[in-house]
């Protein structure tokens, strides 16, 4: 009964002044929630930014993130003999990425079809919960990994079993914390029907009164507690690590280790600059503007920032590459379409010669791991 011709295809929690609230009266009658979607909001929801740019980025993230994190998780769980804290944190990082990325086909379809969500309320809530959950999980596990990397340099000797148990405990605590802090995202109604556009949005238009006040408070709390504080810890760890590496003796092995450490630091810095800082900053600014002015002037930037935050699922594999010898081997061989066993057989003589000449204390193969730089 309707034709929607999309000739020049043109929100998250769109821009609207909230005109009323959803509440249950004393008699148990639900009063309809009122939200505001205006011409600008409508043009964003039908525009190329949301219907072309977002699905392209999400497709790239899915195509790169799914196999790379899938392989990483497989390597860390089944191909790494010694489960060091770094391996545990990276396995959790890969799991967080996978839990987010597996839903991307629905997200891509949603945006391609003009921001029209046809998969039901529950799936929308899961998608959004996992979307934000992944970002905050990544920040926290990256912090743990960074602190652990520094700790290994400062204190290379330590009880592996005890360290591994601590890492498992910390990881479980992080998952529990993220589950708790994302509860509001699962509880809030995320799907809204927009009559003028004949679409049902998922998270792009939020109806609740909490959009104005509570959403600002919520994302401000997350930005401080789950972004700024971990970011400070990560930065501190790397600054101290650079100092330690500068002052250390410079043999061939140390030089290789230092170069890989610098690559890791650059990768993590890039992740913060591209993924975490813009999204957390704009989440707060966006909701602050809605709260104070009734609309957000940074909506397009906010959309782009949240979209770019998903790139952490593509950048994380580079972290695994610089930290884990096992992942490096499997990644190289996967790209060259060779089996690890064949390569290892070919390199047996070379490896034995190298090991006889060099100290193995910094090797990070699955057999002799002390530190994995």
């Amino acid at each position: 009964t309707i034709q929607g011709t999309n000739r020049s295809s043109k929100g998250r929690s769109l821009i609207g002044k909230v005109d009323g609230t959803s509440h249950v009266t004393g008699k148990g009658v639900t009063v309809e929630t009122v939200f505001s979607v205006d011409e600008f909001s409508a043009s964003v929801l039908t525009g190329k930014l949301t219907t072309v740019f977002l699905p392209i980025v999400y497709t790239i993230v899915f195509v790169v993130g799914l196999p790379s994190n899938g392989m990483a998780l497989w390597v860390f769980l089944f191909r790494t003999k010694k489960k060091h804290p770094a391996v545990i944190y990276m396995a959790n990082l890969a799991l967080a990425d996978l839990l987010s990325v597996i839903w991307f086909p629905l997200k891509i379809a949603y945006h391609i079809h003009g921001n029209n969500w046809i998969y039901g309320e529950a799936l929308c809530n899961v998608l959004i919960g996992f979307f934000y959950g992944n970002m905050y999980c990544s920040i926290l596990f990256m912090t743990c990994l960074s602190v652990q990397r520094y700790w290994v340099i400062v204190n290379p000797m330590g009880h592996s079993r005890k360290k591994a148990n601590i890492a498992i405990g910390i990881s479980l605590a992080i998952w529990l914390l993220i589950l708790l802090v994302t509860i509001p995202l699962y509880v809030v109604k995320q799907t809204i029907f927009i009559p003028a556009l004949n679409i049902t949005t998922c998270h792009d238009v939020l109806p609740e009164q909490l959009l104005v006040g509570d959403m600002f408070n919520y994302f401000l709390s997350l930005a401080i507690g789950v972004f700024l504080f971990p970011a400070f810890l990560t930065a501190s760890a790397y600054v101290l690590m650079i100092r330690m590496l500068r002052s250390s003796a410079m043999d061939e092995n140390s030089e290789k280790k230092r170069k890989r450490a610098i690559k890791l630091i650059v990768t993590v810095l890039a992740m913060y600059l591209i993924c975490f800082t813009p999204s957390n900053l704009l989440l707060v600014v966006h909701y602050f503007l809605i709260k104070s002015q009734g609309q957000s002037h940074v909506y397009a930037l906010y959309i782009v920032a949240l979209c770019l935050s998903t790139l952490n699922s593509c950048i994380d594999p580079f972290v695994y590459y610089f930290v884990s010898h096992d992942f490096r081997d499997h990644a190289k061989n996967a790209l060259l379409c060779r089996s690890v066993r064949t390569v290892k057989q070919m390199q047996v003589s070379l490896t034995s010669k190298k090991h006889s000449r060099k100290s193995s204390s910094y090797s990070s193969s699955s057999t002799t791991v002390k530190t994995s730089y």
């Epitope: 009964t1 000739r7 505001s36 043009s43 039908t46 525009g47 029907f193 009559p195 004949n198």
Partner: antibody
Framework: EVQLVESGGGLVQPGRSLKLSCVAS????????MTWIRQAPGKGLEWVAS????????YYPDSVKGRFTVSRDSAKSTLYLQMNSLRSEDTATYYC??????????????WGQGTLVTVSS | DIQMTQSPHSLSASLGETVSIECLAS??????LAWFQQKPGKSPQLLIY???SLQDGVPSRFSGSGSGTQYSLKISNMQPEDEGVYYC?????????FGGGTELELK
């Protein structure tokens, strides 16, 4: 002051085509959705077509889908309705409206004076 | 398509009287309802949108109410300039549809 002036109406034979124009003034044309609504003589109102402010999307009821095309020219602040394969039941006064998107729906806030289209042999 | 049924078809009211026009939708329209007034030989004019929000410049004697499928327009203190045909229109699902109209005249 918002002004919408329709033109292009007249007598036309069944099966022929006609193009209606609506010149807008007194507001920023690019900021608003626009709509065509018709009213057959002595009858009620019928929605005919809507177009988004960017012109990127158009919406039609089944009764005119495939025959009518709504378009807009931002430079001229003009809305158009190209009517092909006209039928006698298309005889009506055609109104051009400037819409507001409020709470996610389209509301026909300003109306032109209308232009009469008569389809008869 | 959503069918909009108006009642009564026509009514007369005295000066200062309060009148009410009903509009019934064939399915729930979540308050996405507008009311228009059309005076003889003139274009329609938006009075009420979103069931109860008064359009700018419209006298406060006009008010809208309702929910679900049933909506009404109330004109308190009937004035001579209120004569005309009143239409309801749903803006919930395409195609947008109008009621058949209610003719209001002064007694």
């Amino acid at each position: 002051e918002v002004q919408l002036v329709e033109s292009g109406g007249g007598l036309v034979q069944p099966g022929r085509s006609l193009k209606l124009s609506c010149v807008a003034s007194g507001f920023t044309f690019n900021n608003y959705w626009m709509t065509w609504i018709r009213q057959a003589p002595g009858k009620g109102l019928e929605w005919v077509a809507s177009i988004t402010n960017s012109g990127g999307r158009t919406y039609y009821p089944d009764s005119v889908k495939g025959r009518f095309t709504v378009s807009r020219d931002s430079a001229k602040s003009t809305l158009y309705l190209q009517m092909n394969s006209l039928r006698s039941e298309d005889t009506a006064t055609y109104y051009c409206t400037r819409d507001r998107i409020i709470r996610g729906s389209t509301w026909f806030t300003y109306w032109g004076q209308g232009t009469l289209v008569t389809v008869s042999s | 398509d959503i069918q909009m049924t108006q009642s009564p078809h026509s009514l007369s009211a005295s000066l200062g009287e309060t009148v009410s026009i009903e509009c019934l939708a064939s399915e729930g329209i979540s308050n996405y309802l507008a009311w228009f007034q059309q005076k003889p030989g003139k274009s329609p004019q938006l009075l009420i949108y979103y069931a109860s929000s008064l359009q700018d410049g419209v006298p406060s004697r006009f008010s809208g109410s309702g929910s679900g499928t049933q909506y009404s327009l109330k004109i308190s203190n009937m004035q001579p300039e209120d004569e005309g045909v009143y239409y309801c229109q749903q803006g919930y699902k395409y195609p947008w549809t109008f009621g058949g109209g209610t003719e209001l005249e002064l007694k």
